[in-house]
Amino acid sequence: KFSKQSWGLENEALIVRCPRQGKPSYTVDWYYSQTNKSIPTQERNRVFASGQLLKFLPAAVADSGIYTCIVRSPTFNRTGYANVTIYKKQSDCNVPDYLMYSTVSGSEKNSKIYCPTIDLYNWTAPLEWFKNCQALQGSRYRAHKSFLVIDNVMTEDAGDYTCKFIHNENGANYSVTATRSFTVKDEQGFSLFPVIGAPAQNEIKEVEIGKNANLTCSACFGKGTQFLAAVLWQLNGTKITDFGEPRIQQEEGQNQSFSNGLACLDMVLRIADVKEEDLLLQYDCLALNLHGLRRHTVRLSRKNPIDHHS
């Protein structure tokens, strides 16, 4: 149940995360399942455990097998299994299916290819990218952080893409490669300057002190899958996370909807236990994409109780 397949090539670095993740700082013990032998934590070993990570620096075919990790707690030990397979390097260019990570799809407007598993490694930019074993060259290809962007994607761009990077551990460098397939979707989409549907510009939202209030920022960005589009809230020009008021939170994850074929996003701002001081703040709904940024400002006002006249 709590098992994960991991694979790598001999003489490359491979780092595996325990499939039963605890929070940071929990003790994690690693064992080689076949022998129940504990994996050492000393970094001088070629294979060693480092908290939630198991590191093969570098990997050998003989390392293949099932590794057990136990996230330790006096009341709730949690066990996971990492099924590790290390393959010999192929002499030819073909990357066999068993070395492939999940396929990603792209379109003319959205052509990001993420380098699989890279977040586990201590690497520095730039990444090297290859398609069908050929180094990618030309202005259409841009290596950006941990992904590759292809401009003006065409059907011929479909194929197997390999990222190559260097993992650094205590001054020693190890090579890592990872390959995934990229397919191209034919999508007649377009992108426009963001259009904010809600809230209206300079809207006054009535709220009740002591009650909860929700503000929705909703914007559309064009048709089809959008590349780099986001909506967010700011308080007095500051990101919600930086503002430091735990009562005021953005709903995690942006909801994506397609209204009349348009690609739209919305973000809900939740204010718990509305206070007087919340009425003094400026609430900005921001929508941004490659075309630019649009901002609508909302202010809160106290909802007056209805007067009952006899």
Epitope: F2, S25, S73, T75
Partner: antibody
């Protein structure tokens, strides 16, 4: 995001059995974690009643063990609390929560149960 | 059972000042390099919210004004600087063994 919601009668007569259900959304209770019941008498502190793990194993507070049963309905993604032979001392806000490791990371809003004739 | 005793029962602190709450366990809650003590905040009418786990680790999304320290039997929650919004009850909880128990709580008021 895990969300929990308690439900059940707000009033129970002395000597009867208190029954509450916690409905979980956003996560399967058989996937992982432990699923707790905690109570808080009005104006007082928190008391851990017990929990049922994703595996179905149960752990109870010994002070309540003889009266407590925690069970689950996996088809509805719910887990339940039964507390028998209640007295006025069992009047409390009852919370369900999720223990991911050692801490209760997600909580329901709580439901007040009053024991009174 | 491990009994957790919090002190003070209540305290009043001005905004910008430091608030310190202690929790003493009737026996050690530390083992294998970790201290299994955690801290929660509870505001009126709301469920508790996790602040600190394993004595000193800040839960994701919790402001860095909150910090925890201690090992063995003596633990401290510190809020520095205190803000008006921090008015709440604070509870320690251990997970060294069953049953899991909570401290009796400390009420923080803002002057």
């Amino acid at each position: 995001q895990v969300q929990l919601q308690e439900s059940g009668p707000g009033l129970v007569k002395p000597s009867q059995t208190l029954s509450l259900t916690c409905t979980v959304s956003g996560y399967s209770i058989t996937s992982d974690y432990a699923w707790d019941w905690i109570r808080q008498p009005p104006g007082k502190g928190l008391e851990w009643i017990g929990y049922i793990r994703y595996s179905g194993d149960t752990y109870y507070n010994p002070s309540l063990k003889s009266r407590v049963t925690i069970s689950r309905d996996t088809s509805k993604n719910q887990f339940s609390l039964k507390l028998s032979s209640v007295t006025a001392a069992d009047t409390a806000v009852y919370y369900c929560a999720t223990t991911m490791m050692d801490t209760m990371d997600y909580w329901g809003q709580g439901t007040l149960v009053t024991v009174s004739s | 059972d491990i009994v957790l005793t919090q002190s003070p029962a209540s305290l009043a602190v001005s905004p910008g000042q430091r608030a310190t709450i202690t929790c003493r366990a009737s026996k050690s809650v530390s083992t294998s390099g970790n201290s299994y003590m955690h801290w929660y905040q509870q505001k009126p009418g709301q469920p508790p919210k996790l602040l600190i786990y394993l004595a000193s680790n800040l839960e994701s999304g919790v402001p860095a004004r909150f910090s925890g320290s201690g090992s063995g039997t003596d633990f401290t929650l510190t809020i520095n600087p205190v803000e008006a919004n921090d008015a709440a009850n604070y509870y320690c909880q251990h997970s060294r063994e069953f049953p899991l128990t909570f401290g009796q709580g400390t009420k923080l008021e803002i002057k």
